[in-house]
């Protein structure tokens, strides 16, 4: 399987909400002993590998924001902790999974990474991630709503093992 990032750049005004999205592509094993662990974290554009550094999103770690379930099942974080920080991660039946960030501030600007780990026979054999940039703007140059910029077809399919 692969992870696609439909949009590589999100430009949003301060105070707006945004939903960052990744999509699980390709054949997904729905075996009884296969689980998909999906999560989000902030990172920086490393010289060697993007998304290799895992930093919290609004003080919440990837452990706080994770989802785990089989195949293309729906799930979402019901953590009070996440919602108190204006965050919610979710996953649908079609392989899309997302993180919603409410009431954006300039401090939310940066690189965001989604991570999917396939757990088979109680350990991971396959890990992939996707990356996208969030720019939060203020002032007269800021858009009135979030503007999203599609990934090039090459970027959205180009996945590096996490």
């Amino acid at each position: 399987f692969k992870v696609a990032t439909p949009y590589s750049l999100y430009v949003c005004p301060e105070g707006q909400n945004v939903t960052l999205t990744c999509r699980l592509l390709g054949p997904v094993d729905k075996g009884h002993d296969v689980t998909f662990y999906k999560t989000w974290y902030r990172s920086s554009r490393g010289e060697v590998q993007t998304c290799s550094e895992r930093r919290p999103i609004r003080n919440l770690t990837f452990q706080d924001l994770h989802l785990h379930h089989g195949g293309h099942q729906a799930a979402n974080t019901s953590h009070d902790l996440a919602q108190r920080h204006g965050l919610e991660s979710a996953s649908d039946h079609h392989g899309n999974f997302s993180i919603t960030m409410r009431n954006l501030t300039l401090l939310d600007s940066g690189l965001y990474c989604c991570l999917v780990v396939e757990i088979r026979h109680h350990h991971s054999e396959h890990r992939v991630h996707g990356a996208m940039e969030l720019q939060v703007q203020t002032g007269k140059d800021a858009p009135s709503n979030c503007v999203v910029y599609p990934s090039s077809s090459q970027d959205s399919e180009n996945i590096t093992a996490a």
Epitope: F62, Q63, H66, H68, V117, H123, S124
Partner: antibody, heavy 119, light 106 residues
Framework: EVQLLESGGGLVQPGGSLRLSCAAS????????MHWVRQAPGKGLEWVSS???????SYNPSLKSRFTISRDNSKNTLYLQMNSLRAEDTAVYYC?????????????WGQGTLVTVSS | QSVLTQPPSASGTPGQRVTISCGGN??????VHWYQQLPGTAPKLLIY???ERPSGVSDRFSGSKSGTSASLAISGLRSEDEADYYC?????????FGGGTKLTVL
């Protein structure tokens, strides 16, 4: 601070049973796969069993029919039920947490509980 | 019989660099992890995913992997490094450990 505290070890006769417990604290227990690993006196580490978030289990093939792993997420506790014990089961039993998001290594271990099988 | 093979013992003098190997079938395609077990204590994660160090582990410890063998290197050897060292990987659906290497600081 992550803490794993095993209990329930002791002296048991061959053929007997014992139930080990591992109390977890300092992390969200239900988010983690958990494992049991044992170490016979003066010997190396031997993997015993693992259990997933949801209760799916995996065992060392040589032990599967006699040992049963389980968990109670509401009590943050991991268990190992050991039946038909033999002298060769004498060991220190450790519970350990599988590290995330890689799910391949054991990042925290308890201090262990000694099980002695002897008549 | 361990699927991962380690030398039973290794030794070095303070300040020296010591390397412990871990061999096994298809080890090049597996993630290898290393644990340190000080006398009378539980194992502690030392290196994960071949080369990564958990926070709090000294940078004197490093991991590498090439071909059919993984290695743990300890530089600037100290007396407190005297311990048993185990490599670990997965074989199908089971966790496997090497037989362990007893490191003596002379």
């Amino acid at each position: 601070e992550v803490q794993l505290l095993e209990s329930g070890g002791g002296l048991v006769q061959p053929g007997g049973s014992l139930r080990l417990s591992c109390a977890a604290s300092g992390f969200t227990f239900s988010n983690y796969y958990m494992h049991w690993v044992r170490q016979a006196p003066g010997k190396g580490l031997e993997w015993v069993s693992s259990i997933s978030f949801t209760g799916s289990t995996s065992y060392n093939p040589s032990l599967k029919s006699r040992f049963t792993i389980s968990r109670d997420n509401s009590k943050n506790t991991l268990y190992l039920q050991m039946n038909s014990l033999r002298a060769e089961d004498t060991a220190v039993y450790y519970c350990a947490r599988l590290g995330i998001p890689f799910f391949t290594y054991l990042d925290y271990w308890g201090q262990g509980t000694l099980v002695t099988v002897s008549s | 019989q361990s699927v991962l093979t380690q030398p039973p013992s290794a030794s070095g003098t303070p300040g020296q660099r010591v390397t412990i190997s871990c061999g096994g079938n298809n080890i090049g395609s597996k993630s290898v992890h290393w644990y340190q077990q000080l006398p009378g204590t539980a194992p502690k994660l030392l290196i994960y995913e071949d080369t990564e160090r958990p926070s709090g582990v000294s940078d004197r410890f490093s991991g590498s992997k090439s071909g059919t063998s993984a290695s743990l290197a300890i530089s600037g050897l100290r007396s407190e490094d005297e311990a048993d060292y185990y490599c670990q990987a997965w074989d199908s659906s089971t966790v496997v450990f090497g037989g362990g290497t007893k490191l003596t600081v002379l």
